[in-house]
């Protein structure tokens, strides 16, 4: 399956979403920190990123939870995380990012 990411809000700041199995979904902010945000932002071509929490509830799937990156990974998929769709979160806990060049 092809996977991609997007920011919902402005071009560089807002809710972090991932595309998996034909559907856009959100990331739970459990364990979500700047190391994870840096990797997410790098996937969009940015060099810096910082984590945001409770940025406004999304809808649909919550695809990822307990994402734990070192910050050196090239994609989120290389980071430790729960299996796709496995979480104990609500959309009130949707993670966000602010990315920067």
């Amino acid at each position: 399956n092809s996977v991609s990411v997007r920011i919902v809000g402005s071009s560089n700041r807002g809710r972090a979403e991932v595309y998996y199995s034909g559907t856009w979904g959100t990331i739970c902010d459990d364990e979500w920190d700047n190391s994870d945000a840096i990797v997410f932002c790098r996937m969009l071509g940015y060099s810096k990123g910082r984590a945001l929490s409770s940025v406004g509830a999304g809808t649909g799937q919550i695809w990822l939870d307990n994402v734990q990156c070192r910050g050196t990974e090239s994609t989120l998929w290389s980071c430790t995380k729960n299996s796709w769709g496995h979480h104990d979160c609500s959309h009130e806990e949707d993670a966000g990012v602010e990315c920067s060049v």
Epitope: N34, K48, R50, S54, G96, S100, V101
Partner: antibody, heavy 120, light 107 residues
Amino acid sequence: EVQLVESGGGLVQPGSSLKLSCVASKFTFSNYGMNWIRQAPKKGLEWIALIYYNSNNKYYADSVKGRFTISRDNSKNTLYLEMNSLRSEDTAMYYCAKSLTGGSDYFDSWGQGVMVTVSS
Amino acid sequence: DVQMTQSPSYLAASPGESVSISCKASKSIGTFLAWYQEKPEKTNKLLIYSGSTLQSGTPSRFSGSGSGTDFTLTIRNLEPEDFAVYYCQQHDEYPFTFGSGTKLEIK
């Protein structure tokens, strides 16, 4: 308009303890990260502590780590700062400030501040 | 810690003029920078975040620019209520740090 009202300041002796409170109103307190920032007399602003909306994450400046504890009670719309082993260099105006979002973020609303004086 | 060096410390200008305040970071902070306004008997106000994004309620005569280590706050066509103290603040890494402030006074 967001309101943040600090209380609990005063004059204390070095080595003693104090607990500051910040009562929030006119916004959904439980959705936002909260911070304590201080300003010593004739000095600049110093961020000292942050707590996430759900209390899951707390961060501190090195100058207060191990001595100060940030906490919150979302049912009471109240932020706290418990200060132990106070030193003269902790003398400052203490402000609570709301984050733009639920965790670490820019400070979009500030209280008027409460003065803490540590002196013998 | 990231050191934030703000200049000038004092600035005198007249209503209607334009002024610029500089803020330099000791390392690259991307665009993770905010500007605040401090006025007596008022609570501190967030003016600009993410380097250049105007906070809701900030007049359009305020603008922010820069990235990396060099940032500028510009106020065009100064109004009487703009005379205040201005601070920059980095939000790239803990601990969040502030500039020492610029006091904008009426000439």
